[in-house]
C-alpha cells in the first residue's frame, strides 16, 4: 500500500538540530565543561 511504501522509503525523522557548543574561556580544564547557548 502507499502508506507502507511511504513508511519504508519516506525520509526518516532526523535528530534535533543541535547548536555547536561554545567554549568561551581562554584556559579550561575538564571540570569546566562548556555549554550550548540557548539550548
Amino acid at each position: 500500500s502507499y502508506s507502507m511504501e511511504h513508511f519504508r522509503w519516506g525520509k526518516p525523522v532526523g535528530k534535533k538540530r543541535r547548536p555547536v557548543k561554545v567554549y568561551p574561556n581562554g584556559a579550561e580544564d575538564e571540570s569546566a565543561e562548556a555549554f550550548p547557548l540557548e539550548f
Epitope: R17, V20, P24, G26, E28, D29, E38
Partner: antibody
Framework: EVQLVESGGGLVQPGGSLRLSCAAS????????MIWVRQAPGKGLESIGM???????YYASSAKGRFTISRDNSKNTLYLQMNSLRAEDTAVYYC???????WGQGTLVTVSS | DIQMTQSPSTLSASVGDRVTITCQAS??????LAWYQQKPGKAPKLLIY???TLASGVPSRFSGSGSGTEFTLTISSLQPDDFATYYC??????????????FGGGTKVEIK
C-alpha cells in the same frame, strides 16, 4: 593548557588522498564538539565538517562524500580523511574546538600535478 | 548548507571611526552567531558569541547585535590594532542533510 596541533599536510596530486591529524592536549577530544575549517590562500574561512561530542558527524556540501571526520579517543586525536582531492582543496586546514579561541596552527594541503 | 553573506567585503576607515559590519544568514539561526578577527598568518580570534556576548579579554569597543537572519558587528572607535579581517560564523548546528556551520566571506578593515 589547551593545545591543538595539526599534521599530515603536504603536496598531493589531483585525485589523491591525504589524512590530516589533530593532536589535542589539555582536554579530552571526545568530550567536545570539534570542527574542521580550511582557508585557501588569500581567501576566507570555510567550515568543512564537524563531529559532535557524541560522535555524530556532519559535512559541508563541498566535503560530503569525499571527506571523513573521525577520532581516536585513546590517542586524543581528531582526523580528517580526504579523498578524490581537487586543486580547489588547496588550503590551510585548521581543527577547532567548537566555537572558541582554541585553533590549531594549521597544516597546508597543496593539490597540484 | 547555511549561507552567510557579509558586507562590505572591504572597508577603509581611520583611527577613531565607528565601524559597522553586517552579516545575513540564509535561514534563521536564532542568536547562534559568532564574530572572529583574523590577522595575516594567524589563526582567527573569537570576539563575540551568542550574537552579542563579548569573549574573554575582548575590548568593550566591540559589540554585536541581531538575531534570526540579520546581525551586526560594531567597533565604536577604531584602534590601530583593529585593522584586520572580520568573519561572522553561524554555529546553529546540523541535522540530517543540513550543515549549519558556515562563515561569511569576510570584511577587511584597512587604513584609509
Amino acid at each position: 593548557e589547551v593545545q591543538l596541533v595539526e599534521s599530515g599536510g603536504g603536496l598531493v596530486q589531483p585525485g589523491g588522498s591525504l589524512r590530516l591529524s589533530c593532536a589535542a592536549s589539555g582536554f579530552t577530544v571526545s568530550n567536545y564538539d570539534m570542527i574542521w575549517v580550511r582557508q585557501a590562500p588569500g581567501k576566507g574561512l570555510e567550515s568543512i565538517g564537524m563531529i559532535y561530542d557524541d560522535g555524530d558527524t556532519y559535512y559541508a556540501s563541498s566535503a560530503k562524500g569525499r571527506f571523513t571526520i573521525s577520532r581516536d579517543n585513546s590517542k586524543n586525536t581528531l582526523y580528517l580523511q580526504m579523498n578524490s582531492l581537487r586543486a580547489e582543496d588547496t588550503a590551510v586546514y585548521y581543527c577547532v574546538k567548537g566555537v572558541s579561541n582554541h585553533w590549531g596552527q594549521g597544516t597546508l594541503v597543496t593539490v597540484s600535478s | 548548507d547555511i549561507q552567510m553573506t557579509q558586507s562590505p567585503s572591504t572597508l577603509s576607515a581611520s583611527v577613531g571611526d565607528r565601524v559597522t559590519i553586517t552579516c545575513q544568514a540564509s535561514q534563521s539561526i536564532s542568536s547562534y552567531l559568532a564574530w572572529y578577527q583574523q590577522k595575516p598568518g594567524k589563526a582567527p580570534k573569537l570576539l563575540i558569541y551568542s550574537a552579542s556576548t563579548l569573549a574573554s579579554g575582548v575590548p568593550s569597543r566591540f559589540s554585536g547585535s541581531g538575531s534570526g537572519t540579520e546581525f551586526t558587528l560594531t567597533i565604536s572607535s577604531l584602534q590601530p590594532d583593529d585593522f584586520a579581517t572580520y568573519y561572522c560564523q553561524s554555529y546553529d548546528g546540523s541535522s540530517g542533510s543540513s550543515y549549519g556551520v558556515g562563515f561569511g566571506g569576510g570584511t577587511k578593515v584597512e587604513i584609509k
